[in-house]
C-alpha cells in the first residue's frame, strides 16, 4: 500500500504530544486558578481540535476559534493588562513576580498554546506532525497565526483602565506595526474602556542612557493611540535586571533611585 500523499509545508510540524500537552496544561491551569474551576478541559480540547482538524490549514478563520474563545472566556481586572512585543520572556518574568498583572499567556487560552505549533489536514482527522504552514513562506491564515490573532484581539478588546505594554528597546523598530501588538492589539483597545496606554521601553545595553521614548517608532505609536482617544505615556526601563529585582523587593534602598 502506497503511503497517502501529505501536504509539505515550510514550517515545523505539530509539537509532539500536542493533544496531551493541551489537556495537561488545561487541567493544571484550572487547578491553580479557582475562577476557572468550572472549565471542562475535555470540552476545551474538543473546541481546540475542532478549530483546525479536517480543515485546510491555509484557510483557517477567526470563526473557527469562536467555540474555544467562548469556553475560555476570562476577564482581567482593570489596570492589570500587560501587553508585550518582542520581549516575551521579561514580560512573563514580570507577571510571575507581580502576580496581579496578566499577559495573554497568563490567561487560559494563551497558557494552553504558548510555544506550541499545530495543524491538521483537509478532510482527515489526523494531526500533521511533519510540517505546518509558515506565516511568510506558505500562508498567514494558518491555525497558529489565526489563533494568536483571535485571542490577542479578544485580550485587547476586554482590557480596561490603564493598559501597559512592554517593548524591546534593543530592536531597530521598538514599535513594529507588523507585530501582533502593532497590527492587532493596538487597534482593538476600546477607547470607552481604556483610559491610557503606558509603554515601558526596555533597554538592552547597560550603558544605554538614551531616552528611547523619543524614538520615531514610539512617536508613531503615540500618534496611533492618541488618534483613538486613548492617552499615551512612555517610560524608559534602563536596567531590566534591577527593574525585576525592585518589583520583587520594592523596599530595597537601591530601588529608590531610577531604574
Amino acid at each position: 500500500v502506497l503511503p497517502r500523499w501529505r501536504q509539505q509545508w515550510s514550517g515545523s510540524g505539530t509539537t509532539s504530544r500536542f493533544p496531551e500537552t493541551v489537556l495537561a496544561r488545561c487541567v493544571k491551569y484550572t487547578e491553580v486558578h479557582p475562577e476557572m474551576r468550572h472549565v471542562d478541559c475535555q470540552s476545551v480540547w474538543d473546541a481546540f481540535k475542532g478549530a483546525f482538524i479536517s480543515k485546510y490549514p491555509c484557510n483557517i478563520t477567526e470563526e473557527d476559534y469562536q467555540p474555544l474563545v467562548k469556553l475560555g472566556t476570562q476577564t482581567v481586572p482593570c489596570n492589570k493588562t500587560l501587553l508585550w512585543s518582542r520581549i516575551k520572556d521579561l514580560a512573563h518574568q514580570f507577571t510571575q513576580v507581580q502576580r496581579d498583572m496578566f499577559t495573554l499567556e497568563d490567561m487560559l487560552l494563551g497558557y494552553l498554546a504558548d510555544d506550541l505549533t499545530w495543524c491538521g489536514e483537509f478532510n482527515t482527522f489526523e494531526i500533521n506532525y511533519q510540517s505546518c504552514p509558515d506565516w511568510r513562506k506558505d500562508c498567514s491564515n494558518n491555525p497558529v497565526s489565526v489563533f494568536w490573532k483571535t485571542v490577542s484581539r479578544r485580550f485587547a478588546e476586554t482590557a480596561c483602565g490603564v493598559v501597559h505594554v512592554m517593548l524591546n528597546g534593543s530592536r531597530s523598530k521598538i514599535f513594529d506595526k507588523n507585530s501582533t501588538f502593532g497590527s492587532v492589539e493596538v487597534h482593538n483597545l476600546q477607547p470607552e474602556k481604556v483610559q491610557a496606554l503606558e509603554a515601558w521601553v526596555i533597554h538592552g545595553g547597560r550603558e544605554d542612557s538614551r531616552d528611547l521614548c523619543q524614538d520615531p517608532t514610539i512617536k508613531e505609536l503615540e500618534s496611533i493611540i492618541s488618534k483613538r482617544n486613548i492617552r499615551f505615556f512612555c517610560k524608559n526601563i534602563y536596567r531590566p535586571d534591577k527593574f525585576l529585582q525592585c518589583v520583587k523587593n520594592p523596599e530595597d534602598s537601591s530601588c529608590l533611585s531610577g531604574i
Epitope: 471542562d40 475535555q42 470540552s43 481540535k49 469562536q66 467555540p67 467562548k70 469556553l71 476577564t75 476586554t158
Partner: antibody, heavy 120, light 111 residues
C-alpha cells in the same frame, strides 16, 4: 428519526416557577450543545440559554440571568430549563434546539422541537 | 432592539430573486459564523444556512448565504409561494456573558 419534544409549559402567576423538559431521541445527545430559544406572541426569536455537551458551561440572555437555569441529564437524554421568578414578559413559546456538535463542524441550531407555551 | 438588524419585510413575485440582509458589528457577525432560519406560519424554525454559506441536506439550492465584514445576506432565487415565511439570521455574540444573537426577522411575502 431525530426528535426534540418540549413539555412543562402552562399558565403560571407572576413570581411563580416552571420547569421545562426536552427529551431527545434519534441522535447522540451527549455530543451536542443544546439551546433554549423563545418567541413572544407576534414577536421574533429570542435566544434564552445554551449549555455545552458535557453540561460544564452555560450562557444566559441578560433578560433571564439569575432567574433561569439550564441543565441536562445525558443519561436520560434530556434538556431542562428551570424558570423562577417568572414575569409577564416571559410569556412565549419556548423551543429547545440541538446546537453545535462537539466536533465543532458547524455552529447552528439544526434541529428544533415543536415548542411549549408558557403564559405568565 | 435586536443586535442584528434585518429589514422587517421583503417581497417578490414567483420566479424572482430576493435578498434579505442582516447587519451586525465587529462583536458578532464579523468574527462568527452566521446561520439563517425559516419559520413558516405556526411552525418551529428550520435551519436553512449554517457557517455563512453551507446548506443542510434537504434545503434546496435556491437558498444561498454570504457574508462580508459585519453583514450577511440570504438570497432566494426562483421564488415560490411556499417560501412565504419569516426569516431570521443568527450568529454568536462576542460579549463575555452571551452566546447567540438573532436578527429581528424579515417577513417575506410572495406576491
Amino acid at each position: 428519526e431525530v426528535q426534540l419534544l418540549e413539555s412543562g409549559g402552562g399558565l403560571v402567576q407572576p413570581g411563580g416557577s416552571l420547569r421545562l423538559s426536552c427529551p431527545a431521541s434519534g441522535f447522540d445527545f451527549s455530543s451536542y450543545w443544546m439551546t433554549w430559544v423563545r418567541q413572544a406572541p407576534g414577536k421574533g426569536l429570542e435566544w434564552v440559554s445554551t449549555i455545552t455537551d458535557s453540561g460544564g458551561r452555560a450562557w444566559y440572555a441578560d433578560s433571564v440571568r439569575g432567574r433561569f437555569t439550564i441543565s441536562r441529564d445525558n443519561s436520560k437524554n434530556t434538556l431542562y430549563l428551570q424558570m423562577n421568578s417568572l414575569r409577564a414578559e416571559d410569556t412565549a413559546v419556548y423551543y429547545c434546539a440541538r446546537d453545535t456538535p462537539k466536533t465543532y463542524y458547524y455552529y447552528a441550531m439544526d434541529v428544533w422541537g415543536q415548542g411549549t407555551t408558557v403564559t405568565v | 432592539q435586536s443586535a442584528l438588524t434585518q429589514p422587517p419585510s421583503a417581497s417578490g413575485t414567483p420566479g424572482q430573486r430576493v435578498t434579505i440582509s442582516c447587519s451586525g458589528s465587529s462583536s458578532n457577525i464579523q468574527y462568527s459564523y452566521v446561520s439563517w432560519y425559516q419559520q413558516l406560519p405556526g411552525t418551529a424554525p428550520k435551519l436553512l444556512i449554517y457557517n455563512n454559506v453551507q446548506r443542510p441536506s434537504g434545503v434546496p439550492d435556491r437558498f444561498s448565504g454570504s457574508k462580508s465584514g459585519t453583514s450577511a445576506s440570504l438570497a432566494i432565487s426562483g421564488l415560490q409561494s411556499e417560501d412565504e415565511a419569516d426569516y431570521y439570521c443568527a450568529t454568536w455574540d462576542e460579549s463575555l456573558l452571551g452566546l447567540w444573537v438573532f436578527g429581528g426577522g424579515t417577513k417575506l411575502t410572495v406576491l
